[in-house]
């Protein structure tokens, strides 16, 4: 999930030096931007979140609000400052004529400004409920551990809190910030106006059809009964909870945001800041058949993005839309036909559909392992929930095309047991934006700040890129994948693992001048390979005749094309042991694998030799996966050989200090 | 703490009616609804409903439906169970619980219904 | 007539354990999991002893403990001491409404 990558409007407008009365002029040659959804029917001209720089303090942000004001003022302009963000973003909310967007650019400390949007409910049917009763046997689904320790904040409508299935685990708190409904004519039913956020809690927490039975839950209205929010009402609730959070430190926090909007900046930084606060952030995917990453706070890479499947593990439909997908999805979850309480009476019960009813499956699931282990990061937690979901139990024919690849085959599942997956090594892969098709243009791959990345692979459709290299970006190593002249683009993709008291480094060796290939090992003692990545200068890279062999006996080493630079991952962490596994096919073929075996996880993954038919490798799971240009259009058999290669790793050190805690 | 008190015992005539109240404190009220409990002398406890104290909405047991109105008000945080056209048999302590739970009663109303 | 069946009455020295089932059907104990139990000492209001089929609420000792198979739940009291002679009764959901059992006398003997 990539912050940067939306699709969204971004309007530059180059600061001034000659601004009117400014007692603070911006430094030289800094440019704040405008962005503003994409969706042109959700935007919400004339309320604008201005965001200031990182470090701005309260009082800062109130003079350049009050500035604001002043200049407006000057020019004949009335602007309303509706609220002052301090806590998680610093900046304000004000009221104001798009005219004077040009002026509040210009103001000191300003980093950008976006324009209000809609965000919405993700869940059908508002009106077509059906009251119907559990229909499973309670004691079927008796959990070890119901969540009792945590505290999962719904951002949501107003719920009906005595609800019989959710009575005494809802705390209602007196936040609410909605915009007015649609409509001349609408007529406000309570009952109506209460249904998601009851039926979510209920899913989440209910004593009867709820996954997180032991969890307290607290309410923030911020969609109206239409299910209808915005932007910005969101993000006061974000900074609600984080002064909730300052004010009285409880155990771990759970977030869910069952609602979506278009790409916003402003809302994926909130969601950033608050994970990185220790919150656990959980939302839906959308409901648009389309690209989570084109929707927030889905596409905020801190936060877990849910999709919805149903009882038999397909992508859910609703109506002509569904289930959004994408590399922004981080696993998929129930979502269609879900039973949860009904606010049409007290012991009601309805089905749901969306992925704001997936997520809540997910929310409720950390919830449960959260209080299992609530020393538990947001890292570790995603890890989990990943290593534990089922696999490759979605069918994938439901995704468009290029989508299939960068969509996770993964629908969350309650762990066997709460306790003992510490000595385990966990792993995920994490896709890149889109590079574009431009000569030079590059895509980065990026783990999370408590992730390292232990390999870097490449992969583009078209077959044209120039590989890719782990280099080091702001004390962080990073995946960057090269397009190539005529190429559609890449992707970058990193293997991101939980590695504890881990030192990583990248070895590289230059093209080799002589024909046997280049060849690059981990020298360090007590250094490990954990991943191989080779990178190229030239256009197109030939056949390398006699194939790329790796030395008996040299495991620490990676090996690839004369022409390319090669790139060893190198590791070294208590305990860690690696091994490589190859598989390697003679005819011509467009899927190569190679997985893993029990206790061992994959951290490497890549292509021998790196020649142009090669379209990339990454890993699915404990899978290498090696594809290849059609083999009817590659001519040569020789050339289409491939070998998949695969790094598996495992640590001594975790599975010992599991050992030692039973 | 939390604390349910209701109003004090109270002596009918067959086919009067009676209002019971029951004040809840030290609790956030939108969260529980109230239910009403009935035991008469030397019997068990019989459910006889439930109201919302976030919506006023109802839920009573058929046994009693049509003769029994359950209300809040919510500036007092006070609910009130009437039972109309009493009969003898409607002779019996009647409790408060808080929410469908009942995790927490009130200390119980004696009604008598006695010509 | 209670629409969960209870043992009338049950008894048991101090010291030893005692079992009170309540039984129902799959519309109400054997359906949810707010199966409830209470304690009521003479002229007193019920006190919550057991909720949810088997969580404590605090302040209530441990030597009480729920169960549920089936439909049938089952209340136990471990190490019975004189004074938990009381009445005591479950209750359960059922898709509309509450129900209750008849009770069983708990004499200590």
């Known amino acids: 999930q990539e912050d940067e990558d939306g699709d969204y409007e971004e309007l530059v407008l180059a600061l001034r030096s000659e601004e009117d009365g400014l007692a603070e002029a911006p430094e030289h040659g800094t440019t704040a931007t405008f962005h503003r959804c994409a969706k042109d029917p959700w935007r919400l001209p004339g309320t604008y979140v201005v965001v200031l720089k990182e470090e701005t303090h309260l009082s800062q942000s109130e003079r350049t609000a009050r500035r604001l004001q002043a200049q407006a003022a000057r020019r004949g302009y009335l602007t309303k400052i509706l609220h002052v963000f301090h806590g998680l973003l610093p900046g304000f909310l004000v009221k104001m004529s798009g005219d004077l967007l040009e002026l509040a650019l210009k103001l000191p400390h300003v980093d950008y400004i976006e324009e209000d949007s809609s965000v919405f409910a993700q869940s059908i049917p508002w009106n077509l409920e059906r009251i119907t009763p559990p229909r499973y046997r309670a004691d079927e689904y008796q959990p070890p551990d119901g969540g009792s320790l945590v505290e999962v904040y719904l951002l949501d409508t107003s719920i009906q809190s005595d609800h019989r299935e959710i009575e005494g685990r809802v705390m209602v708190t007196d936040f609410e910030n909605v915009p007015e409904e649609d409509g001349t004519r609408f007529h406000r039913q309570a009952s109506k106006c209460d249904s998601h956020g009851t039926h979510l809690a209920g899913v989440v927490s209910g004593r009867d059809a709820g996954v997180a039975k032991g969890a307290s839950m607290r309410s923030l209205r911020v969609l109206n009964c239409q299910g209808k929010g915005t932007v910005s009402g969101t993000l006061i609730g974000l900074e609600f909870i984080r002064k909730s959070q300052l004010v009285q430190p409880v155990g771990p926090l759970v977030v869910l945001l069952p609602l979506a909007g278009g790409y916003s900046r402003v809302l994926n930084a909130a969601c950033q800041r608050l994970a990185r606060a220790g919150v656990v952030l959980v939302t839906a995917a959308g409901n648009f058949r389309d690209d989570a990453c084109l929707y927030s706070p889905a596409s905020a890479p801190e936060v877990i993005t849910v999709g919805a499947t149903n009882a038999q593990d397909q992508p859910v439909t609703l109506g002509t839309l569904g289930t959004n997908f994408g590399r922004c999805v981080d696993l998929f979850a129930p979502g269609e036909d879900i039973i949860g309480a009904s606010s049409d009476c007290s012991t009601c019960f309805v089905s749901q559909s969306g992925t704001s009813q997936a997520a809540a499956h997910v929310a409720g699931i950390a919830a449960m392992m959260l209080s299992a282990e609530p020393e538990l990061t947001l890292a570790e937690l995603r890890q989990r929930l990943i290593h534990f979901s089922a696999k490759d139990v979605i069918n994938e024919a439901w995704f468009p095309e290029d989508q299939r690849v960068l969509t996770p085959n993964l629908v969350a599942a309650l762990p066997p047991s709460t306790h003992g997956a510490g000595w385990q090594l966990f792993c995920r892969t994490v896709w890149s934006a889109h590079s574009g098709p431009t000569r030079m243009a590059t895509a980065v791959a990026r783990c999370a700040p408590d992730e390292e990345l232990l390999s870097c692979s490449s992969f583009s459709r078209s077959g044209k890129r120039r590989g890719e290299r782990m280099e080091a970006q702001g004390g962080k190593l990073v995946c960057r994948a090269h397009n190539a002249f005529g190429g559609e683009g890449v992707y970058a993709i990193a293997r991101c693992c939980l590695l504890p008291q881990a030192n990583c480094s990248v070895h590289t060796a230059p093209p080799a001048e002589a024909s046997m290939g280049t060849r690059v090992h981990c020298h360090q003692q007590g250094h490990v390979l954990t991943g191989c990545s080779s990178h190229w200068e030239v256009e197109d890279l030939g056949t390398h005749k006699p194939p790329v062999l790796r030395p008996r006996g040299q495991p620490n080493q990676c090996v690839g094309h004369r022409e390319a630079s090669i790139h060893a991952s190198c590791c070294h962490a208590p305990g860690l042991e690696c091994k490589v596994k190859e598989h390697g096919i003679p005819a011509p073929q467009e899927q190569v694998t190679v997985a893993c075996e029990e206790g061992w996880t994959l951290t490497g993954c890549s292509a021998l030799p790196g020649t142009s038919h090669v379209l990339g490798a990454y890993a699915v799971d404990n899978t290498c996966v090696v594809r290849s240009r059609d083999v009817s259009t590659t001519g040569s058999t020789s050339e289409g050989a491939v070998t998949a290669v695969a790094i598996c790793c495992r640590s001594r050190h975790l599975a010992q200090a599991s050992q030692e805690l039973q | 703490q939390v604390q349910l008190v209701q109003s004090g015992a109270e002596v009918k005539k067959p086919g009067a009616s009676v209002k019971v109240s029951c004040k809840a404190s030290?609790?956030?009220?939108?969260?529980?609804?109230i239910s009403w409990v009935r035991q008469a002398p030397g019997q068990g406890l019989e459910w006889m409903g439930w109201?919302?104290?976030?919506?006023?909405?109802?839920n009573y047991a058929q046994k009693v439906q049509g003769r029994v109105t359950m209300t809040t008000d919510t500036s007092t945080s006070t609910v009130y169970m009437e039972l109309r056209s009493l009969r003898s048999d409607d002779t019996a302590v009647y409790y408060c619980?808080?929410?469908?739970?009942?995790?927490?009663w009130g200390q119980g109303t004696t009604v008598t219904v006695s010509s | 007539q209670s629409a969960l069946t209870q043992p009338a009455s049950v008894s048991g020295s101090p010291g030893q354990s005692i079992t009170i089932s309540c039984t129902g059907t799959s519309s109400d104990v054997g359906g949810y999991n707010s199966v409830s139990w209470y304690q009521q000492h003479p002229g007193k209001p019920p006190k919550l002893m057991i909720y949810?089929?088997?969580n404590r609420p605090s302040g209530v000792s441990n030597r009480f403990s729920g169960s549920k198979s089936g439909n049938t739940a089952s209340l136990t009291i471990s190490g019975l001491q004189a004074e938990d002679e009381a009445d005591y009764f479950c209750s359960s959901y059922t898709s509309t409404s509450m129900v209750f059992g008849g009770g069983t006398k708990l004499t200590v003997l």
């Open positions: 030290g609790y956030p009220l939108t969260s529980y609804g």
């Open positions: 619980a808080r929410g469908y739970g009942m995790d927490v």
């Open positions: 949810e089929v088997s």
């Open positions: 109201i919302s104290a976030y919506n006023g909405n109802t």
